[in-house]
């Protein structure tokens, strides 16, 4: 079999749900003497970068100006060590929102809970689209989807205080273009009277993975690398 | 707003040269990614060659060898130097630019490009 080169990492620098006519930078994370990165769209390359020195450095970051539906879509990276290709990336789906309207969010039976209460989200957008997402802040990865011609429904099922945070929704075009987010509704969830002060509220991370933890190699780094290899050599 | 003016088409033999001139209006040219691209009769836009802010180069393995990309960016200019010209390479040919650019990405999707010039037409024939 051809041989090749571990799968590099590919993330969103900020977030994948990038508005219209802003920029994108996507990560592509590789191995230290890497010659060239591909950024590849929709299974078409996009973009090349080829790192100086490669020695050096263990990823790219790939921009992507002024956002729009055309470049919205599935993004993967490839690198190259020598005449050696890596395997692909995983896909990443870059999502342009703040396209055509502003939908509206609301809470049934209303935003105060207590703990087992039965909630549902409507999401409301009058414009054209069948499909309506939910999403909770800090949460931007776990992506709730639902169906319908103006409004659409997310049942929660009996709340905890884990449900707790803030909610937004949006109007989906397509599986990549959507729509303007609604204005947030945040969901109070109170327990007991014993656990209440107890119960932690679900930290808003904001997508602590979404961020690009590309390195520089320095001298400082080699020399410390070589002091251990030589350190393990007279241990032996 | 970059405003992108292409020059230099025209009739050439089979094997002759061409050199392709893309004027830049505006102040942000040196930190656009700059590329060609070409669109033969009834056929779609295809990629020809592109060049980062910092001049690294990518080329369509249609033209590697014999079609040089390079860029002027105190004239604001973009050029495409085409050698041994072939029947084939009857096309429109488009500069575009990306802008504005961070980092030393070549583009070599038409989608990343957000400004076109008009075109100029190269015509290879006996």
């Known amino acids: 079999p051809k041989q090749t080169l571990p799968k590099p990492i590919i993330r969103a620098e900020s977030t994948y749900m990038v508005p219209k006519e802003k920029q994108a930078t996507l990560c592509c994370q590789g191995s230290y003497g890497a010659v060239e990165y591909q950024l590849h769209f929709e299974g078409s390359l996009f973009a090349v970068e080829r790192p100086k020195p490669p020695e050096r450095i263990n990823g790219v970051k790939f921009h992507i100006p002024d956002m729009n539906s055309r470049k919205a879509g599935r993004y993967s990276c490839i690198y190259r060590v020598g005449e050696l290709w890596s395997e692909r990336s995983d896909l990443l789906d870059l999502v342009v929102t703040e396209m055509y309207d502003t939908p509206t969010l609301s809470v049934h039976p209303g935003p105060e809970v207590t703990s087992g209460e039965k909630v549902t989200f409507y999401c409301r957008l009058d414009t054209a689209t069948s499909m309506f997402l939910l999403l909770k802040e800090g949460r931007s990865r776990d992506v709730q989807r639902s169906y319908g011609k103006v409004q659409a429904e997310f049942p929660m099922g009996p709340v905890t205080t884990a449900h707790r945070g803030s909610y937004r929704c949006f109007g989906s075009y397509n599986n990549y273009a959507w729509s303007f987010p609604s204005e947030p509704v945040k969901l109070l969830v109170t327990g007991d009277i014993e656990n209440t002060s107890l119960a932690p509220t679900d930290p808003t991370f904001p997508d602590s993975w979404d961020t690009c933890l590309l390195t520089r190699e320095t001298g400082l780094q080699k020399d410390l690398a070589l002091w251990d290899h030589t350190a393990q050599n007279l241990l032996r | 707003e970059v405003q992108l003016v292409e020059s230099g088409g025209g009739e050439v033999q089979p094997g002759g040269s061409l050199r392709l001139s893309c004027a830049a209006s505006?102040?942000?040219?040196?930190?656009?990614?700059m590329g060609w691209f070409r669109q033969a009769p009834g056929k779609g836009r295809e990629f020809v060659a592109a060049?980062?802010?910092?001049?690294?180069?990518y080329y369509a393995e249609s033209v590697k060898g014999r079609f040089t990309i390079s860029r002027d960016n105190a004239k604001n200019t973009l050029y495409l130097q085409m050698s041994s010209l072939r029947a084939e390479d009857t096309a429109v040919y488009y500069c575009?630019?990306?802008?504005?650019?961070?980092?030393?990405?070549?583009?070599?999707?038409?989608?990343?490009?957000?400004?076109w010039g008009q075109g100029t037409l190269v015509t290879v024939k006996p």
């Open positions: 060049i980062s802010r910092s001049d690294d180069t």
């Open positions: 575009a630019a990306v802008v504005p650019t961070y980092g030393n990405n070549i583009y070599v999707h038409s989608a990343a490009y957000n400004y």
């Open positions: 505006g102040r942000t040219f040196a930190s656009a990614a």
